[in-house]
Amino acid sequence: VPPGEDSKDVAAPHRQPLTSSERIDKQIRYILDGISALRKETCNKSNMCESSKEALAENNLNLPKMAEKDGCFQSGFNEETCLVKIITGLLEFEVYLEYLQNRFESSEEQARAVQMSTKVLIQFLQKKAKNLDAITTPDPTTNASLLTKLQAQNQWLQDMTTHLILRSFKEFLQSSLRALRQM
């Protein structure tokens, strides 16, 4: 069910239309639902979810991560800097979400939903941001070669990459959700 169309909203016709913040909040929660379903399939299919953090850390993926300097943590919180980091991070995740598209059997539609919902979330956030010039869009050529490289990995590494992308994307969205609710 797309955000804003759940039974709660139907049952409460007197409810005010969703604000921009509520829409963003709902969108993130919807994507997190999708990630949860994809992680279930991944964990059932392989033992990656039990892998030690050390083994995961050895993987050389450059996945976006929140750090204190990004202005999203309570100490040094900066709304505009943080918003730029969230949007930039989501744009950087897009190539990894593209990689996920052929990685699922029973959850193929869910993987597509996560990808499309993330695009919508980026649009919502871009409307909220004042300083769009500070947002750097990933280079398409670099993304294309990264995608080719990831798809050329052996089966074990592809399983590991899938697990890592889902885990990191979930963490990034949770950090974003927390920060956005402080705005």
Partner: antibody
Framework: QVTLKESGPTLVKPTQTLTLTCSFS??????????VGWVRQPPGKALEWLAF???????YYSPSLESRLTITKDTSKNQVVLTMTNMDPVDTATYYC??????????????WGQGTLVT | DIQMTQSPSSLSAFVGDGVTMTCWAS??????LNWYHQRPGEAPELLVF???NLQIGVPSRFRGSGSETYFTLTINSLQPEDSGTYFC?????????FGGGTKLEI
């Protein structure tokens, strides 16, 4: 099974610093979406939130007590420590540590320690 | 900061009765509202999270509802063990705030 337990002094003199330790098991404070908070309750009164620390070391404090509070974590020891400076008789309360852990960050405390009474 | 107000501050009822208590937020908190039950001398226990989701192990006679600024907790078919104080808590953003509590006597 998730458990938390508070430890620290039961008696503190005015102006002294209170150090409370929350030792937990059954979960990891390095898992995304997981956090540990401190809540206190003066005798016969309501609950009051004090501080919170997240898996990624992001920290939040009650604005009215922020200048007196410090929260830290030791992930390898499964511990969270709260220090509260310049203690006063009005700080007499049962101090609880509690876990928050859900994908959507509802900031709900699903498991609590038994509490420790500090006078 | 978001203020949470609970009503009534106390109520009494008989075993088998149903009761409803309310919680108001000073501003919209969507569905980020949690309910706890505390018996004397014990730690609070989570009953309901996200306004209407029952925590695992909580009997179905408990029901949370509401959104934005107005929330209710309804208990049907009261049992002796339901006595104690009920607290609501905003989970929208920091600082986290609790209501003053509703003391229920059975």
């Amino acid at each position: 099974q998730v458990t938390l337990k508070e430890s620290g002094p039961t008696l503190v003199k005015p102006t002294q610093t209170l150090t409370l330790t929350c030792s937990f098991s059954g979960f990891s404070l390095s898992t995304s979406g997981v956090g540990v908070g401190w809540v206190r309750q003066p005798p016969g009164k309501a609950l009051e939130w004090l501080a919170f620390i997240w898996w990624d070391d992001d920290k939040y404090y009650s604005p009215s007590l922020e200048s007196r509070l410090t929260i830290t974590k030791d992930t390898s020891k499964n511990q969270v420590v709260l220090t509260m400076t310049n203690m006063d008789p009005v700080d007499t309360a049962t101090y609880y540590c509690a876990r928050s852990a859900d994908d959507y960050l509802y900031y709900s405390f699903d498991t609590w320690g038994q509490g420790t009474l500090v006078t | 900061d978001i203020q949470m107000t609970q009503s009534p501050s106390s109520l009494s009822a008989f075993v088998g009765d149903g009761v409803t208590m309310t919680c108001w937020a000073s501003q919209s908190i969507n569905d980020y509202l949690n309910w706890y039950h505390q018996r004397p001398g014990e730690a609070p226990e989570l009953l309901v999270f996200a306004a209407s989701n029952l925590q695992i192990g909580v009997p179905s006679r408990f029901r949370g509802s509401g959104s934005e600024t107005y929330f209710t907790l309804t208990i049907n078919s009261l049992q002796p063990e339901d006595s104690g104080t009920y607290f609501c808590q905003s989970g929208h953003s920091f600082p986290l705030t609790f209501g003053g509590g509703t003391k229920l006597e059975i």
